[in-house]
């Protein structure tokens, strides 16, 4: 658990995070694990700690090995242990799967290459990146912060990327490359925002007193299969089922597919009996997937008995 | 010695919102996380969420989202913990208590609120 | 989310004896456990943290062990000042208490 897996190749400056969490403030000891040896913290050393971080400055072989970090809070010391193993370089092109981080899969519409571990390293832009040891060149692809953004993507783009930067510390220039393998989805599938076509945000909804009222929640969430997708509703920020009242409850509508390709998702909340301090709550209708959560709230009002003639002109 | 002393006991009709101070002595809010937990009458403990107060950070647990707010000033060495909406379900003794991001260490003793129309 | 089964909710003993409370999780969760002892009007005071961390101050009757999905607070030797109320915590993902164990005289 409080374990992570490191490498690195020799020559490269390699960094490694304590797999504790802490706060910034908080001290980190690093030790070599097999003696117990304490870890420098001056930057002229080649290997020094520097609160959450070891910097190999740059990595050898000889580096390998487990190293201790233990985290100290004014209440708590933790302990987290580096796993770190540092690989000579490669003659040949082929990078062996012991140096690849996890793999990423694109498709037409989403085709960004995150560069692993980066955001450890004080790096400046552009990044280099490469496929299959050759560099990229032309308009289909894009530098962009720390991802390559590849447009109109087809299936031969599948391979091995590497990016190529150069970590400063204190002046001096390491070099570091990274690889993963990018393979690309056959479906054109994407995933947006969620989107709440019903009820509209800060909706006024009349019922009637005594009278069942539904409230739909309707979102969509992109096209194709979506990994992971779900609305509810909430009665004054609780779950409805944590809520209490048996009066009303949530029932799963159609999982919709329009012609144009959106998958949408229905929630009807059913209000049975509508009573005095229904009108009281909050009703939030939620829509949720892994780009985040948007919540449109609606209110109740009683219905005017005598509304329906509200439409009718009156003549003087 | 680490101390956290908390506000007096409240009583709040259902609907309100009430808000409870812990404030600590012998120890800066900011080096740590801040924890509340919430124990119903003859009830086990459930731990409502954290805050960073260095920089604001919250979590909430999932059964307080949306009804729970943890605020902490640091300049007085004081957290806050706001519920809202109060239901009679939420009469409860509410404790803070100082620890990291894991586990709460030093608690306070604990605030009564009895929520009755 | 992870759930924890704490076992026994009620555990009757006597001074000298030697007790076990067990906390079960659905999923592995290492050795992020951790054991308060609670006491009738008092505040929870923090006895083992990372599953077999003793706590300063905290008798060494008291241990913790385990890793996984199962962890056990052992009571080498009962005193009449342990009986309390018992909870395990974990902190794998947020936070969850156990149900508590309520340990009694016999």
């Known amino acids: 658990k409080f374990s992570k897996q490191s490498w690195g190749l020799e020559n490269e400056a390699l960094i490694v995070r304590c797999p504790r969490q802490g706060k910034p403030s908080y001290t980190v000891d690093w030790y070599y694990s097999q003696t117990n040896k304490s870890i420098p913290t001056q930057e002229r050393n080649r290997v020094f700690a520097s609160g959450q971080l070891l910097k190999f400055l740059p990595a050898a072989v000889a580096d390998s090995g487990i190293y201790t970090c233990i985290v100290r809070s004014p209440t708590f010391n933790r302990t987290g242990y580096a796993n770190v193993t540092i690989y000579k370089k490669q003659s040949d092109c082929n990078v062996p799967d012991y140096l690849m981080y996890s793999t990423v899969s694109g498709s037409e519409k989403n085709s960004k290459i995150y560069c692993p571990t980066i955001d450890l390293y004080n790096w400046t832009a552009p990044l280099e990146w490469f496929k299959n040891c050759q560099a990229l060149q032309g308009s289909r692809y894009r530098a962009h912060k720390s991802f390559l953004v590849i447009d109109n993507v087809m299936t031969e783009d599948a391979g091995d990327y590497t990016c190529k930067f150069i970590h400063n510390e204190n002046g001096a220039n390491y070099s570091v490359t990274a690889t993963r393998s990018f393979t690309v989805k056959d479906e054109q599938g994407f995933s947006l925002f969620p989107v709440i076509g019903a009820p509209a945000q800060n909706e006024i909804k009349e019922v009637e007193i005594g009278k069942n009222a539904n409230l739909t929640c309707s979102a969509c969430f992109g096209k194709g299969t979506q990994f992971l997708a779900a609305v509810l509703w909430q009665l004054n920020g609780t779950k409805i089922t944590d809520f209490g009242e048996p009066r009303i409850q949530q029932e799963e509508g159609q999982n919709q597919s329009f012609s144009n390709g959106l998958a949408c998702l229905d929630m009807v909340l059913r209000i049975a009996d509508v009573k005095e301090e229904d009108l009281l709550l909050q009703y939030d209708c939620l829509a949720l997937n892994l780009h985040g959560l948007r919540r449109h709230t609606v209110r109740l009002s009683r219905k005017n008995p005598i509304d329906h003639h509200s439409h009718h002109h009156h003549h003087h | 010695e680490v101390q956290l002393v908390q506000s007096g006991a409240e009583v709040k009709k259902p609907g309100a919102t009430v808000k409870i101070s812990c404030k600590v002595s012998?120890?800066?809010?900011?080096?740590?996380?801040m924890h509340w937990v919430q124990q119903a009458p003859g009830k086990g403990l459930e731990w409502m969420g954290r805050i960073d107060p260095a920089i604001g950070n919250t979590e909430y647990a999932e059964k307080f989202q949306g009804r729970v707010t943890i605020t902490a000033d640091t300049s007085t060495d004081t957290a806050y913990m706001e519920l809202s909406s109060l239901r009679s379900e939420d009469t409860a003794v509410y404790y803070c208590?100082?620890?990291?991001?894991?586990?709460?260490?030093?608690w306070g003793q604990g605030t009564l609120v009895t929520v009755s129309s | 989310d992870i759930q924890l089964t704490q076992s026994p909710s009620f555990l009757s003993a006597s001074v000298g004896d030697r007790v076990t409370i067990t906390c079960i999780t659905n999923t592995d969760i290492d050795d992020v456990i951790h054991w308060y002892q609670q006491k009738p009007g008092k505040a929870p005071k923090l006895l083992i943290y990372e599953g077999n961390t003793l706590r300063p101050g905290v008798p060494s009757r008291f241990s913790g062990s385990g890793s996984g999905t199962e962890f056990t607070l052992t009571i080498s030797s009962l005193q009449p000042e342990d009986f309390a109320t018992y909870y395990c915590l974990q902190s794998d993902n947020m936070l969850t208490f156990g149900q508590g164990t309520k340990l009694e005289i016999k």
């Open positions: 012998a120890f800066n809010i900011k080096d740590d996380y």
């Open positions: 208590a100082t620890g990291d991001f894991y586990a709460m260490a030093y």
